[in-house]
């Protein structure tokens, strides 16, 4: 079995995480994707999740996560905006595959959020206006249920995670058509 | 129907094990984790862990480390709680709840509870 | 870990009024994505608990809606709008932000 392997980032309160977990094009583009964060015991819990099937390009915010999956690159785009102490933690990207369970993607993301002004570009990012917010009525709840397995048979392509800008081929250039996604209703 | 169905009351001397177990049915045993919790004679509710029937993987409390063990059985969808070295003070109504999938952490079913008496 | 405070610890109340629950949290219980972990559970007497709210706001299937969930980060409540005779038992407000999951130390409702 594969060790999971972990990436350490350190950052302020109110920067902005940014993931980007690599997979495999053919196999995956369309899959549901998610982001988990992974408690004690290897507990993880679906913090947010792309729509089913998921859409190119087209972002999908709950709360301070902002997911975007880019069919073309292959590639999930998760980012944490205004980050909080609270949010340190262990995360990582998983694919849905059912009726098989989750297909995990490297690296893990060790997240450790300190306190402290920071004047990096982008630490205020505010991508959370102009959102467009699906009605209170909405009954379905987005995430499927999951566990994950504790053994990894063979090593999906490494996540990479930054709190640069956006690279300029995937640069998101208008924050209008955010999805305001409810899990639950 | 979603259903938690627990073992029978226990009555133990101190110092020794008690194992219960909870036979879960109406859905997918491997999708949901479960939890362990415990509640003393008159007094509140107390998180003991948790185990993800699906890889099997467990999350004690500190309290509890060491003493306590949980495992799973897919074939039977049945968790068990082991509880060793008892004392007096364990005696209380021990029940296994299953965490919501999904989002939410919430303990949407519960079983209907097994007293474990410790007592010389 | 996150400890949990109820308040009061007795509630007597009167058919056809209303109720109100407070639980605090020693740490924020909202997460990244917006929910707040925070449930509220019924334990009638004798009985299992029962998941009345979760995420802090959200009703579980089958609680009348005389039930309500609110607050935010550290403070929440649990609001009864009239308190029905069937509704007397011990309320638990728990947080399940992190691993341990915590309990309040419970609100015993009955009626006077």
């Known amino acids: 079995a594969t060790k999971l392997t972990e990436e350490k980032y350190e950052l302020k309160e109110g920067q902005t995480l940014d993931v980007k977990c690599d997979y495999t094009l053919e196999k995956f583009a369309s899959s549901q994707k998610a982001w988990q964060i992974i408690r004690d015991g290897e507990m993880p819990k679906t913090l947010a999740c792309t729509e089913r099937p998921s859409k190119n390009s087209h972002p999908v915010q709950v709360g301070r996560i902002i997911l975007e999956d880019y069919h073309d690159h292959g590639l999930l785009r998760v980012r944490m905006v205004n980050l909080q102490v609270e949010d340190s933690g262990l995360y990582q990207c998983v694919i849905y595959q059912p009726p098989k369970e989750p297909h995990m993607l490297f690296d893990r993301i060790r997240l450790v959020v300190t306190k402290g002004f920071s004047g990096t570009p982008g630490s205020n990012e505010n991508s959370t206006q102009n959102v467009y917010k699906i009605p209170p009525t909405t009954t379905k709840a987005l995430c499927p249920l999951y566990t994950s397995p504790r053994t990894v048979t063979q090593a999906p392509p490494k996540s990479t995670a930054d709190v640069s800008t956006p690279d300029s081929e995937i640069n998101l250039t208008n924050v209008t058509d955010i999805i305001r996604v409810p899990v639950f209703n | 129907q979603v259903q938690l169905v627990q073992s029978g009351a226990e009555v133990k001397k101190p110092g020794a094990s008690v194992k219960v177990s909870c036979k879960a049915s109406g859905y997918t045993f491997t999708s949901y984790y479960m939890h362990w919790v415990r509640q003393a004679p008159g007094q509140g509710l107390e998180w003991m862990g948790v185990i993800n029937p699906g890889g099997g993987s467990t999350s004690y409390a500190q309290k509890f480390q060491g003493r306590v063990t949980m495992t799973r059985d897919t074939s039977t969808s049945t968790v068990y709680m082991e509880l060793s070295s008892l004392r007096s003070e364990d005696t209380a109504v021990y029940y296994c709840?299953?965490?919501?999938?999904?989002?939410?952490?919430?303990?949407?079913?519960w079983g209907q509870g097994t007293m474990v008496t410790v007592s010389s | 870990d996150i400890v949990m405070t109820q308040s009061p610890l007795s509630l007597p109340v009167t058919p056809g009024e209303p109720a109100s629950i407070s639980c605090r949290s020693s740490q924020s219980l909202l997460h990244s994505n917006g929910y707040n972990y925070l449930d509220w559970y019924l334990q009638k007497p004798g009985q299992s608990p029962q998941l009345l709210i979760y995420?802090?706001?959200h009703r579980a299937s089958g609680v009348p809606d005389r039930f309500s969930g609110s607050g935010s980060g550290t403070d929440f409540t649990l609001k009864i709008s009239r308190v029905e005779a069937e509704d007397v038992g011990v309320y638990y407000c728990m947080q399940g932000r992190q691993v341990p999951f915590t309990f309040g130390g419970g609100t015993k409702v009955e009626i006077k």
């Open positions: 995420l802090g706001s």
């Open positions: 709840a299953r965490e919501a999938g999904q989002t939410s952490s919430a303990l949407d079913v």
